[in-house]
């Protein structure tokens, strides 16, 4: 009896610890898209509607906060497109990018962890023009660092929110 | 504030050429498209080209490929419409007109004509 | 080749009236859609566009509505001034305008 007892705490414990584990799914807000045909900053995203989801993590001022020291998966997906209905591509050649970037508050600094992308030719004879870029990647992170995303050209981001998102799981505490 | 001054009235004979301006002012020139836009008597307007004003890059309609060219001095914040081989039916007022979204916005240039210039009357006539 | 096409071609209307003009495309350009005003020997005038979205400087008595491939353009109170021909626009095509007049 007592093992059991103690089995039924050991699954409580996991249990517990595993609804703990952080993780942030966060999608891109489309009314809310900044202008410009450099790189930028994306800095609004949904964190509780739809697919977006988010805890033990903060979405604060355009940053996905890590709140717990540990190892985490990062990912980002972004997908480009433009529709003749829309206008014409004022340019034909295109760099369609994302960087996932690292700041740390407690020594300020800022580090690129991922980049993804191309160079694209993107005729004026086509109708429609799609592309997608998907990163991710296994970080160190500690307490109070800030994820942000940039990209470039962000007039021609897909809004949806199965197209325009990022997000990140603990996978393991630092020993 | 913005404005777009074009070159004056202008007649010509059927076969010959005509070269339109389009001085702008009170905006960052090479940050905006331009476009041409003309409208011959008792039709509808009728859109001709644009250019992006910052890297020259042009696009025309299917009707005007091979007899329209779209230039623009950045220095001279001017825009030029040349039409060549006139014939009667280009007789109508050609008007140019700044695309609303400028390419610090955006590289779309989204067809929202949000400044024009005040037209200038060409007559094609023998 | 998308075709815009406007009704009416022309209307007359009473100082005060409530003015509707249709435009339709031929097939579904979400809400790319402007508005343009034109007066004989003046530079046309952008009124609305995306649809619904009023051009700065522009009175409030106008006003924009419709999606997919049917748009109206509302004067809710014409006035004198409102005398002129309106052209409705997606991208590189017009509509074949529609004259105001008063009666």
């Known amino acids: 009896e007592k093992a059991m007892v103690d089995g039924s705490w050991l699954d409580l414990a996991k249990r517990s610890k595993l609804e703990a584990q952080p993780f942030a799914h966060l999608t891109i807000n489309a009314t809310d898209i900044p202008s410009g045909s450099h790189k930028v900053s994306l800095s609004s995203w949904y964190h509780d509607r739809g697919w977006a989801k988010i805890s033990n993590m903060t979405f604060s001022n355009g940053k996905l906060i890590v709140n717990q020291d540990g190892f985490y998966y990062l990912y980002a997906n972004i997908c480009f497109r433009h529709h003749e209905t829309s206008g014409d591509l004022a340019t034909e050649y295109l760099q369609l990018m994302v960087y996932v970037t690292k700041t740390s508050i407690k020594i300020p600094s800022s580090h690129t962890l991922m980049k993804g992308g191309s160079t694209k030719y993107w005729s004026g004879n086509s109708e429609f023009h799609f592309y997608s870029i998907n990163v991710g990647g296994f970080f160190k992170l500690r307490s109070g660092e800030e994820i942000s995303i940039e990209v470039s050209n962000p007039s021609l981001l897909d809004p949806d929110q199965d197209a325009t998102y990022f997000g990140a799981f603990k996978v393991r505490d630092i020993d | 504030q913005v404005q777009l001054v074009q070159s004056g009235a202008e007649v010509r004979k059927p076969g010959a050429s005509v070269k339109v301006s389009c001085k702008a002012s009170?905006?960052?020139?090479?940050?905006?498209?331009i476009h041409w836009v003309r409208q011959a008597p008792g039709q509808r307007l009728e859109w001709m080209g644009w250019i992006n004003a910052g890297n020259g890059n042009t696009k025309f309609s299917q009707k005007f490929q091979g007899r329209i060219t779209v230039t623009r001095d950045t220095a001279a914040s001017t825009a030029y419409m040349e039409l060549r081989s006139l014939r009667s039916e280009d007789t109508a007022v050609y008007y140019c007109?700044?695309?609303?979204?400028?390419?610090?916005?955006?590289?779309?240039?989204?067809?929202?004509?949000?400044?024009w210039g005040q037209g200038t009357l060409v007559t094609v006539s023998s | 080749e998308i075709v815009m096409t406007q009704s009416p071609s022309s209307l007359s209307a009473s100082v005060g009236d409530r003015v509707t003009i249709t435009c339709r495309a031929s097939?579904?350009?979400?809400?790319?859609l402007n508005w343009y005003q034109l007066k004989p020997g003046k530079a046309p005038r952008l009124l609305i566009y995306?649809?619904?979205s009023l051009q700065s400087g522009v009175p409030s008595r106008f006003s924009g509505s419709g999606s997919g491939a049917e748009f109206t353009l509302t004067i809710s109170s014409l006035q004198p001034e409102d005398i002129a021909t309106y052209y409705c626009q997606h991208t590189r095509a017009f509509g074949q305008g529609t004259k105001v007049e008063i009666k």
């Open positions: 009170g905006y960052d020139f090479s940050n905006y498209a």
């Open positions: 097939q579904s350009i979400s809400r790319y």
């Open positions: 995306g649809a619904s």
């Open positions: 007109a700044r695309d609303s979204s400028g390419m610090v916005r955006g590289i779309i240039i989204a067809y929202y004509f949000d400044y």
